[in-house]
Protein backbone atom coordinates (compact mmCIF):
# COMPACT_ATOMS: atom_id res chain seq x y z
CA UNK A 1 0.00 0.00 0.00
CA UNK A 2 1.31 3.64 -0.45
CA UNK A 3 3.07 5.51 2.28
CA UNK A 4 1.30 6.38 5.38
CA UNK A 5 2.13 8.67 8.33
CA UNK A 6 2.79 6.33 10.97
CA UNK A 7 2.96 7.85 14.67
CA UNK A 8 3.88 4.53 15.84
CA UNK A 9 2.76 2.55 19.08
CA UNK A 10 1.50 5.97 21.76
CA UNK A 11 2.53 4.52 24.68
CA UNK A 12 1.58 7.77 26.38
CA UNK A 13 -1.83 7.00 25.91
CA UNK A 14 -2.20 3.52 28.31
CA UNK A 15 -5.64 3.40 27.71
CA UNK A 16 -6.78 1.00 30.90
CA UNK A 17 -10.27 0.21 31.25
CA UNK A 18 -12.52 -2.12 33.13
CA UNK A 19 -13.76 -5.69 32.00
CA UNK A 20 -17.42 -5.81 31.32
CA UNK A 21 -17.83 -2.32 31.93
CA UNK A 22 -18.57 0.14 28.62
CA UNK A 23 -15.57 2.12 27.05
CA UNK A 24 -15.10 4.94 24.72
CA UNK A 25 -11.73 5.71 23.02
CA UNK A 26 -11.46 8.77 21.19
CA UNK A 27 -8.71 8.45 18.21
CA UNK A 28 -5.55 10.40 19.51
CA UNK A 29 -4.97 11.30 15.81
CA UNK A 30 -7.18 14.22 16.50
CA UNK A 31 -6.35 14.90 19.84
CA UNK A 32 -2.23 14.80 20.01
CA UNK A 33 -0.89 14.40 16.56
CA UNK A 34 -3.13 16.63 13.90
CA UNK A 35 -3.58 19.99 13.60
CA UNK A 36 -7.23 19.17 12.33
CA UNK A 37 -10.51 17.92 14.42
CA UNK A 38 -12.26 14.85 13.21
CA UNK A 39 -15.33 16.78 11.34
CA UNK A 40 -12.66 18.53 9.19
CA UNK A 41 -11.27 15.76 7.91
CA UNK A 42 -14.54 14.04 7.18
CA UNK A 43 -16.00 17.22 5.28
CA UNK A 44 -12.68 17.13 3.59
CA UNK A 45 -13.55 13.22 2.73
CA UNK A 46 -11.21 11.77 5.07
CA UNK A 47 -12.20 7.90 6.42
CA UNK A 48 -11.09 6.96 9.97
CA UNK A 49 -10.76 3.36 9.68
CA UNK A 50 -10.58 0.99 12.99
CA UNK A 51 -7.98 -2.02 13.34
CA UNK A 52 -6.47 -4.06 16.22
CA UNK A 53 -3.77 -6.89 16.96
CA UNK A 54 -4.18 -9.07 19.89
CA UNK A 55 -2.14 -9.50 23.16
CA UNK A 56 0.62 -11.42 22.23
CA UNK A 57 -0.45 -11.60 18.79
CA UNK A 58 1.15 -9.92 15.68
CA UNK A 59 -1.08 -9.80 12.99
CA UNK A 60 -2.82 -6.86 12.76
CA UNK A 61 -6.66 -7.50 11.65
CA UNK A 62 -10.30 -5.34 11.05
CA UNK A 63 -12.27 -4.90 14.19
CA UNK A 64 -15.38 -6.98 14.03
CA UNK A 65 -18.32 -3.89 13.94
CA UNK A 66 -21.45 -7.01 13.65
CA UNK A 67 -21.12 -8.72 16.94
CA UNK A 68 -24.60 -8.85 18.66
CA UNK A 69 -25.98 -5.93 20.08
CA UNK A 70 -23.15 -3.84 18.63
CA UNK A 71 -21.07 -4.65 21.36
CA UNK A 72 -18.32 -2.42 19.31
CA UNK A 73 -19.29 0.49 17.51
CA UNK A 74 -17.66 3.40 16.12
CA UNK A 75 -19.16 6.53 16.02
CA UNK A 76 -17.41 9.74 14.91
CA UNK A 77 -13.82 9.87 16.16
CA UNK A 78 -14.53 7.80 19.03
CA UNK A 79 -14.52 3.04 19.27
CA UNK A 80 -17.09 2.58 21.74
CA UNK A 81 -16.94 -1.17 23.76
CA UNK A 82 -20.50 -1.82 25.16
CA UNK A 83 -19.33 -3.82 27.44
CA UNK A 84 -15.62 -4.70 27.22
CA UNK A 85 -14.21 -8.20 27.22
CA UNK A 86 -11.40 -9.07 28.79
CA UNK A 87 -9.86 -10.61 25.24
CA UNK A 88 -10.40 -6.78 23.87
CA UNK A 89 -7.40 -6.11 25.69
CA UNK A 90 -4.86 -5.39 22.51
CA UNK A 91 -2.93 -2.13 20.33
CA UNK A 92 -5.49 -0.73 18.72
CA UNK A 93 -5.01 1.84 15.56
CA UNK A 94 -6.92 4.20 13.90
CA UNK A 95 -6.07 5.34 10.21
CA UNK A 96 -7.21 8.43 8.51
CA UNK A 97 -7.15 8.21 4.83
CA UNK A 98 -8.13 9.13 1.43
CA UNK A 99 -6.50 8.60 -2.08
CA UNK A 100 -3.98 10.91 -1.29
CA UNK A 101 -3.14 11.19 2.66
CA UNK A 102 -3.05 8.76 5.24
CA UNK A 103 -2.15 8.77 8.90
CA UNK A 104 -2.56 6.73 11.33
CA UNK A 105 -1.43 6.10 15.22
CA UNK A 106 -1.77 2.77 17.67
CA UNK A 107 -2.10 2.50 21.47
CA UNK A 108 -2.80 -0.01 24.08
CA UNK A 109 -5.51 -1.03 24.85
CA UNK A 110 -5.74 -2.65 28.85
CA UNK A 111 -8.86 -4.81 29.88
CA UNK A 112 -8.66 -4.85 33.50
CA UNK A 113 -10.25 -6.86 36.15
CA UNK A 114 -11.45 -5.65 39.63
CA UNK A 115 -12.44 -7.23 42.75
CA UNK A 116 -15.01 -6.52 45.12
CA UNK A 117 -13.26 -3.75 46.78
CA UNK A 118 -12.18 -2.31 43.44
CA UNK A 119 -8.52 -3.31 43.65
CA UNK A 120 -6.65 -3.69 40.26
CA UNK A 121 -4.13 -3.07 37.87
CA UNK A 122 -6.12 0.53 36.98
CA UNK A 123 -3.12 3.47 37.34
CA UNK A 124 -5.55 5.75 39.81
CA UNK A 125 -5.76 9.68 39.09
CA UNK A 126 -4.72 11.19 43.01
CA UNK A 127 -6.85 14.09 43.91
CA UNK A 128 -5.24 15.93 46.94
CA UNK A 129 -7.43 17.94 49.62
CA UNK A 130 -6.17 20.47 52.07
CA UNK A 131 -6.35 19.42 55.79
CA UNK A 132 -9.41 20.85 57.97
CA UNK A 133 -9.74 23.56 55.63
CA UNK A 134 -13.52 23.40 54.88
CA UNK A 135 -15.83 21.48 52.34
CA UNK A 136 -14.05 19.93 49.73
CA UNK A 137 -15.73 17.84 47.20
CA UNK A 138 -14.37 15.14 44.81
CA UNK A 139 -16.13 14.32 41.24
CA UNK A 140 -16.42 10.94 39.41
CA UNK A 141 -14.57 11.72 36.81
CA UNK A 142 -14.37 10.72 33.35
CA UNK A 143 -18.11 9.83 32.78
CA UNK A 144 -18.63 12.44 30.24
CA UNK A 145 -20.37 11.46 26.78
CA UNK A 146 -21.55 7.95 27.87
CA UNK A 147 -25.04 8.73 28.39
CA UNK A 148 -27.16 11.56 27.49
CA UNK A 149 -27.78 14.54 29.70
CA UNK A 150 -31.95 13.01 29.70
CA UNK A 151 -30.44 9.90 31.40
CA UNK A 152 -30.38 10.64 35.31
CA UNK A 153 -27.63 7.85 36.65
CA UNK A 154 -27.66 6.27 40.25
CA UNK A 155 -24.08 7.21 41.12
CA UNK A 156 -23.27 4.93 44.88
CA UNK A 157 -19.67 6.32 46.25
CA UNK A 158 -17.95 3.44 48.38
CA UNK A 159 -14.21 3.78 50.36
CA UNK A 160 -12.55 0.58 49.70
CA UNK A 161 -14.83 -1.99 50.06
CA UNK A 162 -17.74 0.11 52.39
CA UNK A 163 -20.40 1.98 50.88
CA UNK A 164 -20.50 5.58 51.86
CA UNK A 165 -23.52 5.39 53.74
CA UNK A 166 -24.22 7.67 57.14
CA UNK A 167 -20.32 8.25 57.36
CA UNK A 168 -20.07 11.67 59.90
CA UNK A 169 -17.96 13.15 57.51
CA UNK A 170 -18.19 12.36 54.19
CA UNK A 171 -21.31 12.85 52.07
CA UNK A 172 -22.66 11.75 48.88
CA UNK A 173 -24.02 14.37 46.66
CA UNK A 174 -24.78 12.52 43.21
CA UNK A 175 -21.55 12.39 41.49
CA UNK A 176 -19.97 14.81 43.89
CA UNK A 177 -18.58 13.13 47.02
CA UNK A 178 -18.09 16.06 49.77
CA UNK A 179 -15.40 15.99 52.88
CA UNK A 180 -16.60 17.99 55.29
CA UNK A 181 -13.23 18.49 57.19
CA UNK A 182 -10.55 16.40 55.68
CA UNK A 183 -8.28 14.66 58.22
CA UNK A 184 -5.27 11.87 57.44
CA UNK A 185 -8.02 9.47 57.89
CA UNK A 186 -9.78 10.26 54.82
CA UNK A 187 -6.44 9.06 53.00
CA UNK A 188 -7.39 5.85 50.34
CA UNK A 189 -9.16 5.19 47.71
CA UNK A 190 -12.91 6.39 46.79
CA UNK A 191 -14.83 4.92 43.89
CA UNK A 192 -17.98 6.21 42.22
CA UNK A 193 -20.34 3.14 40.43
CA UNK A 194 -22.64 5.07 37.61
CA UNK A 195 -25.19 2.96 36.86
CA UNK A 196 -27.48 3.96 33.83
CA UNK A 197 -30.09 2.49 31.32
CA UNK A 198 -29.56 1.89 27.54
CA UNK A 199 -31.69 0.33 25.17
CA UNK A 200 -32.92 -1.69 27.48
CA UNK A 201 -29.94 -2.60 29.17
CA UNK A 202 -28.06 -2.09 32.54
CA UNK A 203 -24.62 -0.53 32.38
CA UNK A 204 -21.76 0.06 34.90
CA UNK A 205 -19.10 2.79 35.04
CA UNK A 206 -16.55 1.81 38.03
CA UNK A 207 -13.93 5.05 38.85
CA UNK A 208 -11.74 4.83 41.46
CA UNK A 209 -9.58 7.43 42.55
CA UNK A 210 -6.46 8.15 45.35
CA UNK A 211 -7.87 10.79 48.25
CA UNK A 212 -4.60 12.30 49.61
CA UNK A 213 -5.16 14.39 52.14
CA UNK A 214 -2.19 16.99 52.27
CA UNK A 215 -0.76 20.84 54.37
CA UNK A 216 -3.29 23.32 54.01
CA UNK A 217 -2.79 26.95 52.08
CA UNK A 218 -3.85 28.61 55.62
CA UNK A 219 -0.71 26.80 57.42
CA UNK A 220 1.73 27.63 54.45
CA UNK A 221 5.29 29.43 55.53
CA UNK A 222 7.66 30.28 53.46
CA UNK A 223 10.75 27.49 53.32
CA UNK A 224 12.59 27.73 56.89
CA UNK A 225 16.24 26.38 57.11
CA UNK A 226 17.34 24.38 60.40
CA UNK A 227 20.56 24.03 59.42
CA UNK A 228 23.26 25.75 59.16
CA UNK A 229 21.99 27.60 61.57
CA UNK A 230 24.04 30.32 64.51
CA UNK A 231 24.31 27.99 67.44
CA UNK A 232 26.81 25.08 64.67
CA UNK A 233 30.13 26.37 63.68
CA UNK A 234 32.10 24.33 61.69
CA UNK A 235 35.55 24.17 62.45
CA UNK A 236 38.09 22.28 60.23
CA UNK A 237 41.91 21.98 60.02
CA UNK A 238 43.26 21.95 56.69
CA UNK A 239 43.51 18.86 55.06
CA UNK A 240 40.44 17.31 56.83
CA UNK A 241 36.72 17.21 55.21
CA UNK A 242 34.12 19.57 55.46
CA UNK A 243 30.53 18.64 55.61
CA UNK A 244 27.94 21.18 55.88
CA UNK A 245 24.46 19.93 55.52
CA UNK A 246 21.73 22.51 54.51
CA UNK A 247 18.26 21.69 55.62
CA UNK A 248 15.04 23.21 54.56
CA UNK A 249 11.25 22.55 55.74
CA UNK A 250 8.53 23.46 52.70
CA UNK A 251 5.32 23.29 53.26
CA UNK A 252 2.75 21.66 51.25
CA UNK A 253 2.15 23.88 48.36
CA UNK A 254 -0.01 22.96 45.12
CA UNK A 255 2.08 22.97 41.91
CA UNK A 256 5.41 24.75 43.44
CA UNK A 257 8.65 24.05 42.90
CA UNK A 258 11.03 23.73 45.67
CA UNK A 259 14.45 24.62 44.90
CA UNK A 260 17.59 24.40 47.72
CA UNK A 261 21.24 25.84 46.38
CA UNK A 262 24.68 26.50 47.58
CA UNK A 263 26.63 29.40 46.98
CA UNK A 264 30.08 29.61 47.94
CA UNK A 265 31.49 33.21 47.69
CA UNK A 266 27.97 34.24 45.66
CA UNK A 267 28.72 31.88 42.80
CA UNK A 268 27.16 28.06 42.09
CA UNK A 269 29.13 25.22 42.88
CA UNK A 270 29.72 24.29 39.64
CA UNK A 271 30.85 27.57 38.42
CA UNK A 272 34.08 27.56 40.87
CA UNK A 273 37.29 25.64 40.86
CA UNK A 274 36.74 23.75 44.27
CA UNK A 275 36.18 20.24 44.21
CA UNK A 276 32.57 20.23 45.90
CA UNK A 277 30.33 17.23 45.80
CA UNK A 278 26.83 18.16 47.07
CA UNK A 279 24.78 14.93 48.01
CA UNK A 280 20.75 15.86 48.13
CA UNK A 281 17.65 13.75 50.18
CA UNK A 282 14.03 14.71 50.45
CA UNK A 283 11.87 13.25 52.65
CA UNK A 284 7.81 14.08 53.19
CA UNK A 285 5.79 14.01 56.05
CA UNK A 286 2.08 12.47 55.49
CA UNK A 287 0.62 15.85 54.63
CA UNK A 288 3.31 16.25 51.82
CA UNK A 289 5.46 19.22 53.41
CA UNK A 290 8.92 18.51 52.59
CA UNK A 291 12.53 18.22 54.16
CA UNK A 292 15.22 18.69 51.88
CA UNK A 293 18.65 18.30 53.04
CA UNK A 294 22.13 19.44 50.68
CA UNK A 295 25.26 18.24 52.07
CA UNK A 296 28.08 20.36 50.72
CA UNK A 297 31.25 18.39 51.19
CA UNK A 298 35.07 19.13 50.50
CA UNK A 299 36.79 15.94 50.62
CA UNK A 300 40.18 17.89 51.69
CA UNK A 301 39.45 21.36 52.91
CA UNK A 302 42.47 24.15 52.38
CA UNK A 303 42.87 27.27 54.14
CA UNK A 304 41.65 29.29 52.08
CA UNK A 305 38.32 27.42 51.99
CA UNK A 306 37.61 27.87 55.12
CA UNK A 307 37.93 31.69 54.81
CA UNK A 308 35.10 31.62 52.18
CA UNK A 309 31.55 32.30 52.34
CA UNK A 310 28.94 29.46 52.73
CA UNK A 311 25.37 30.28 51.82
CA UNK A 312 22.57 27.70 51.48
CA UNK A 313 19.58 29.18 49.98
CA UNK A 314 15.80 28.36 49.73
CA UNK A 315 12.91 28.78 47.32
CA UNK A 316 9.06 28.39 47.06
CA UNK A 317 6.12 30.32 45.68
CA UNK A 318 6.15 31.37 49.61
CA UNK A 319 9.56 33.22 48.97
CA UNK A 320 12.76 33.00 49.54
CA UNK A 321 15.45 32.29 52.30
CA UNK A 322 19.27 32.13 52.65
CA UNK A 323 21.60 31.08 55.74
CA UNK A 324 25.41 31.38 55.60
CA UNK A 325 27.12 28.65 57.58
CA UNK A 326 29.73 29.36 60.31
CA UNK A 327 32.92 28.08 59.07
CA UNK A 328 36.19 28.90 60.58
CA UNK A 329 39.84 27.30 60.27
CA UNK A 330 40.71 25.38 63.89
CA UNK A 331 43.81 27.32 65.61
CA UNK A 332 46.11 23.64 66.27
CA UNK A 333 46.15 22.80 69.77
CA UNK A 334 49.79 23.72 70.85
CA UNK A 335 52.16 21.52 71.39
CA UNK A 336 53.76 20.87 74.56
CA UNK A 337 57.16 19.79 74.61
CA UNK A 338 57.73 23.49 72.82
CA UNK A 339 55.08 26.03 72.81
CA UNK A 340 54.20 24.97 75.87
CA UNK A 341 57.36 24.96 77.80
CA UNK A 342 58.30 28.51 76.01
CA UNK A 343 55.77 29.90 77.64
CA UNK A 344 56.48 28.51 80.64
CA UNK A 345 59.95 30.33 80.53
CA UNK A 346 61.93 27.17 79.96
CA UNK A 347 64.92 27.12 77.15
CA UNK B 1 2.78 -5.31 65.67
CA UNK B 2 -1.16 -5.24 65.67
CA UNK B 3 -3.17 -6.71 68.62
CA UNK B 4 -6.66 -6.89 69.23
CA UNK B 5 -7.50 -7.54 72.90
CA UNK B 6 -10.49 -8.51 73.64
CA UNK B 7 -12.63 -8.43 77.07
CA UNK B 8 -13.43 -11.77 79.33
CA UNK B 9 -15.71 -14.43 79.41
CA UNK B 10 -19.71 -13.72 80.10
CA UNK B 11 -23.01 -15.42 81.33
CA UNK B 12 -26.01 -13.99 80.88
CA UNK B 13 -30.09 -14.54 80.98
CA UNK B 14 -31.95 -14.85 78.19
CA UNK B 15 -33.56 -11.31 77.79
CA UNK B 16 -30.37 -9.50 79.04
CA UNK B 17 -27.85 -7.98 76.88
CA UNK B 18 -23.68 -7.89 76.34
CA UNK B 19 -21.68 -5.76 75.67
CA UNK B 20 -18.24 -7.34 74.34
CA UNK B 21 -14.89 -4.87 73.77
CA UNK B 22 -11.65 -5.18 71.63
CA UNK B 23 -8.74 -3.44 72.31
CA UNK B 24 -6.41 -2.58 69.28
CA UNK B 25 -2.78 -1.77 69.18
CA UNK B 26 -0.44 -1.02 66.70
CA UNK B 27 -2.07 0.98 63.91
CA UNK B 28 -3.73 4.34 64.06
CA UNK B 29 -7.77 3.27 65.67
CA UNK B 30 -9.34 5.58 63.40
CA UNK B 31 -7.85 4.22 60.05
CA UNK B 32 -9.80 0.80 60.13
CA UNK B 33 -12.65 -0.80 59.70
CA UNK B 34 -13.19 -3.19 63.02
CA UNK B 35 -15.73 -6.56 62.36
CA UNK B 36 -17.41 -8.73 64.30
CA UNK B 37 -17.64 -12.66 64.05
CA UNK B 38 -19.25 -14.91 66.04
CA UNK B 39 -19.12 -19.20 66.27
CA UNK B 40 -21.64 -20.55 68.19
CA UNK B 41 -19.98 -24.16 69.81
CA UNK B 42 -19.52 -26.59 66.59
CA UNK B 43 -20.89 -24.23 64.32
CA UNK B 44 -18.67 -22.30 61.76
CA UNK B 45 -17.88 -18.41 61.70
CA UNK B 46 -20.75 -15.76 60.73
CA UNK B 47 -20.08 -12.31 60.14
CA UNK B 48 -22.42 -9.39 62.25
CA UNK B 49 -21.33 -6.25 61.90
CA UNK B 50 -18.23 -3.59 62.00
CA UNK B 51 -17.94 0.06 61.98
CA UNK B 52 -15.02 2.31 60.71
CA UNK B 53 -14.03 4.57 63.73
CA UNK B 54 -12.97 7.52 61.54
CA UNK B 55 -15.80 7.98 59.84
CA UNK B 56 -18.57 6.60 62.38
CA UNK B 57 -19.54 4.36 60.02
CA UNK B 58 -21.54 1.21 61.05
CA UNK B 59 -22.75 -1.45 58.82
CA UNK B 60 -24.80 -4.91 60.12
CA UNK B 61 -25.99 -7.97 59.05
CA UNK B 62 -29.68 -8.20 58.18
CA UNK B 63 -30.21 -11.44 60.83
CA UNK B 64 -28.56 -8.76 63.11
CA UNK B 65 -30.67 -5.67 62.62
CA UNK B 66 -31.96 -4.02 65.41
CA UNK B 67 -30.57 -6.22 67.73
CA UNK B 68 -26.79 -5.70 67.64
CA UNK B 69 -24.96 -2.42 68.18
CA UNK B 70 -21.35 -1.53 67.24
CA UNK B 71 -19.60 1.31 68.91
CA UNK B 72 -15.80 2.59 69.14
CA UNK B 73 -14.24 5.05 71.56
CA UNK B 74 -11.02 6.39 69.48
CA UNK B 75 -9.71 7.56 72.76
CA UNK B 76 -9.19 4.28 74.22
CA UNK B 77 -8.60 2.65 71.04
CA UNK B 78 -11.63 0.07 71.99
CA UNK B 79 -14.50 -1.20 69.73
CA UNK B 80 -17.77 -2.40 71.31
CA UNK B 81 -20.59 -4.67 70.08
CA UNK B 82 -23.55 -4.84 72.26
CA UNK B 83 -26.20 -7.81 71.61
CA UNK B 84 -29.38 -7.26 73.18
CA UNK B 85 -32.55 -9.65 73.94
CA UNK B 86 -30.16 -12.43 74.07
CA UNK B 87 -31.81 -16.06 73.52
CA UNK B 88 -29.72 -19.02 74.29
CA UNK B 89 -28.92 -19.88 70.93
CA UNK B 90 -26.51 -16.41 70.99
CA UNK B 91 -24.28 -18.47 72.80
CA UNK B 92 -21.49 -18.49 71.08
CA UNK B 93 -17.55 -17.56 70.84
CA UNK B 94 -17.65 -13.54 69.66
CA UNK B 95 -14.87 -12.33 67.57
CA UNK B 96 -13.66 -8.83 66.31
CA UNK B 97 -11.25 -8.94 63.39
CA UNK B 98 -9.76 -6.28 61.10
CA UNK B 99 -8.48 -6.25 57.42
CA UNK B 100 -5.36 -5.05 56.92
CA UNK B 101 -7.07 -1.42 55.06
CA UNK B 102 -10.47 -0.67 53.81
CA UNK B 103 -9.38 -2.03 50.50
CA UNK B 104 -9.62 -5.78 52.07
CA UNK B 105 -11.86 -8.26 52.69
CA UNK B 106 -10.49 -10.86 54.61
CA UNK B 107 -9.26 -10.73 58.29
CA UNK B 108 -5.35 -10.42 58.45
CA UNK B 109 -5.80 -9.80 62.34
CA UNK B 110 -8.56 -11.49 64.90
CA UNK B 111 -8.77 -10.69 68.73
CA UNK B 112 -8.52 -13.94 70.98
CA UNK B 113 -12.29 -14.48 71.63
CA UNK B 114 -15.17 -13.75 74.11
CA UNK B 115 -17.12 -16.46 75.40
CA UNK B 116 -20.89 -15.38 75.84
CA UNK B 117 -22.88 -18.16 77.35
CA UNK B 118 -26.95 -17.36 77.81
CA UNK B 119 -28.26 -19.34 80.29
CA UNK B 120 -31.20 -18.95 82.74
CA UNK C 1 -26.97 -13.63 50.54
CA UNK C 2 -23.79 -15.93 49.07
CA UNK C 3 -23.97 -19.73 50.92
CA UNK C 4 -20.66 -21.19 50.87
CA UNK C 5 -20.59 -25.18 51.03
CA UNK C 6 -17.14 -26.87 51.98
CA UNK C 7 -16.69 -30.56 51.64
CA UNK C 8 -15.65 -32.62 52.62
CA UNK C 9 -17.18 -32.15 56.70
CA UNK C 10 -14.04 -34.17 57.54
CA UNK C 11 -10.78 -35.17 55.87
CA UNK C 12 -8.86 -38.22 57.45
CA UNK C 13 -5.38 -38.07 56.10
CA UNK C 14 -1.93 -39.09 57.55
CA UNK C 15 0.92 -37.01 58.00
CA UNK C 16 3.11 -36.15 54.93
CA UNK C 17 -0.17 -36.89 52.52
CA UNK C 18 -1.71 -34.75 50.86
CA UNK C 19 -5.17 -32.85 51.25
CA UNK C 20 -7.07 -31.49 49.38
CA UNK C 21 -10.49 -29.29 50.49
CA UNK C 22 -13.23 -27.89 48.58
CA UNK C 23 -15.16 -24.84 48.84
CA UNK C 24 -18.36 -24.14 46.65
CA UNK C 25 -20.24 -20.73 46.48
CA UNK C 26 -23.82 -20.63 45.40
CA UNK C 27 -22.81 -18.05 42.72
CA UNK C 28 -19.66 -16.38 41.64
CA UNK C 29 -17.75 -14.73 43.42
CA UNK C 30 -14.60 -14.60 41.14
CA UNK C 31 -11.80 -14.62 43.30
CA UNK C 32 -12.49 -12.77 46.03
CA UNK C 33 -12.19 -15.70 48.84
CA UNK C 34 -9.90 -16.48 51.71
CA UNK C 35 -9.19 -19.46 52.96
CA UNK C 36 -8.71 -19.37 57.32
CA UNK C 37 -7.06 -22.21 59.60
CA UNK C 38 -8.52 -22.70 63.51
CA UNK C 39 -7.24 -24.96 65.94
CA UNK C 40 -9.37 -25.76 69.44
CA UNK C 41 -9.78 -22.66 71.51
CA UNK C 42 -8.15 -20.33 69.09
CA UNK C 43 -8.67 -17.36 66.98
CA UNK C 44 -8.77 -17.87 63.17
CA UNK C 45 -5.31 -17.65 61.11
CA UNK C 46 -5.43 -16.03 57.68
CA UNK C 47 -4.46 -18.33 54.99
CA UNK C 48 -5.12 -17.25 51.62
CA UNK C 49 -6.60 -14.74 50.10
CA UNK C 50 -7.24 -13.55 46.88
CA UNK C 51 -8.43 -17.63 46.08
CA UNK C 52 -4.62 -18.19 45.56
CA UNK C 53 -2.01 -15.43 47.55
CA UNK C 54 -0.22 -16.50 50.90
CA UNK C 55 -0.52 -14.60 53.46
CA UNK C 56 2.81 -13.56 55.18
CA UNK C 57 4.05 -16.41 56.90
CA UNK C 58 2.12 -18.81 55.12
CA UNK C 59 4.42 -22.10 54.43
CA UNK C 60 4.31 -22.93 50.83
CA UNK C 61 2.84 -26.01 51.16
CA UNK C 62 -0.30 -24.15 51.64
CA UNK C 63 -2.33 -23.37 48.20
CA UNK C 64 -5.36 -22.29 46.62
CA UNK C 65 -6.61 -22.13 43.28
CA UNK C 66 -10.25 -21.57 41.71
CA UNK C 67 -12.29 -18.91 41.07
CA UNK C 68 -16.06 -18.23 40.37
CA UNK C 69 -17.69 -20.73 42.20
CA UNK C 70 -15.66 -23.86 42.63
CA UNK C 71 -11.98 -23.24 44.96
CA UNK C 72 -9.27 -25.39 45.96
CA UNK C 73 -7.23 -25.84 49.33
CA UNK C 74 -4.70 -27.86 49.17
CA UNK C 75 -2.11 -28.84 51.79
CA UNK C 76 0.74 -30.56 49.50
CA UNK C 77 2.36 -32.53 52.76
CA UNK C 78 0.64 -32.56 55.69
CA UNK C 79 3.01 -31.43 59.23
CA UNK C 80 1.82 -32.55 62.48
CA UNK C 81 0.27 -28.46 63.52
CA UNK C 82 -1.69 -28.72 60.04
CA UNK C 83 -4.16 -30.91 61.44
CA UNK C 84 -7.35 -28.43 62.34
CA UNK C 85 -10.46 -26.84 60.97
CA UNK C 86 -10.45 -24.69 57.97
CA UNK C 87 -12.60 -22.05 56.71
CA UNK C 88 -13.54 -20.57 53.51
CA UNK C 89 -14.83 -16.89 53.41
CA UNK C 90 -16.25 -15.11 50.27
CA UNK C 91 -16.31 -11.13 50.29
CA UNK C 92 -17.41 -10.83 46.62
CA UNK C 93 -20.82 -9.31 48.47
CA UNK C 94 -22.57 -8.10 51.47
CA UNK C 95 -22.89 -9.84 53.82
CA UNK C 96 -19.18 -11.58 53.55
CA UNK C 97 -20.07 -15.05 54.83
CA UNK C 98 -18.32 -17.94 55.52
CA UNK C 99 -18.75 -21.56 54.73
CA UNK C 100 -19.07 -24.34 58.00
CA UNK C 101 -15.15 -25.54 57.69
CA UNK C 102 -13.76 -29.06 56.85
CA UNK C 103 -11.93 -30.82 60.47
CA UNK C 104 -8.99 -32.14 59.15
CA UNK C 105 -8.01 -34.64 61.06
CA UNK C 106 -5.43 -37.82 61.94
CA UNK C 107 -6.61 -40.88 59.77
Known amino acids: SERCDDWGLDTMRQIQVFEDEPARIKCPLFEHFLKFNYSTAHSAGLTLIWYWTRQDRDLEEPINFRLPENRISKEKDVLWFRPTLLNDTGNYTCMLRNTTYCSKVAFPLEVVQKDSCFNSPMKLPVHKLYIEYGIQRITCPNVDGYFPSSVKPTITWYMGCYKIQNFNNVIPEGMNLSFLIALISNNGNYTCVVTYPENGRTFHLTRTLTVKVVGSPKNAVPPVIHSPNDHVVYEKEPGEELLIPCTVYFSFLMDSRNEVWWTIDGKKPDDITIDVTINESISHSRTEDETRTQILSIKKVTSEDLKRSYVCHARSAKGEVAKAAKVKQKVPAPRYTVELACGFGAT | QVQLVQSGAEVKKPGSSVKVSCKAS????????FHWVRQAPGQGLEWMGG????????FYAQKFQGRVTITADESTSTAYMELSSLRSEDTAVYYC?????????????WGQGTLVTVSS | EIVMTQSPATLSVSPGERATLSCRAS??????LAWYQQKPGQAPRLLIYGASTRATGIPARFSGSGSGTEFTLTISSLQSEDFAVYYC?????????FGQGTKVEIK
Open chain 2, 26 to 33: GGVFSYYA
Open chain 3, 89 to 97: QQYNNWPWT
Open chain 3, 27 to 32: QSVSSN
Open chain 2, 97 to 109: ARPVSYSSGWYDY
Open chain 2, 51 to 58: IIPGYGAT
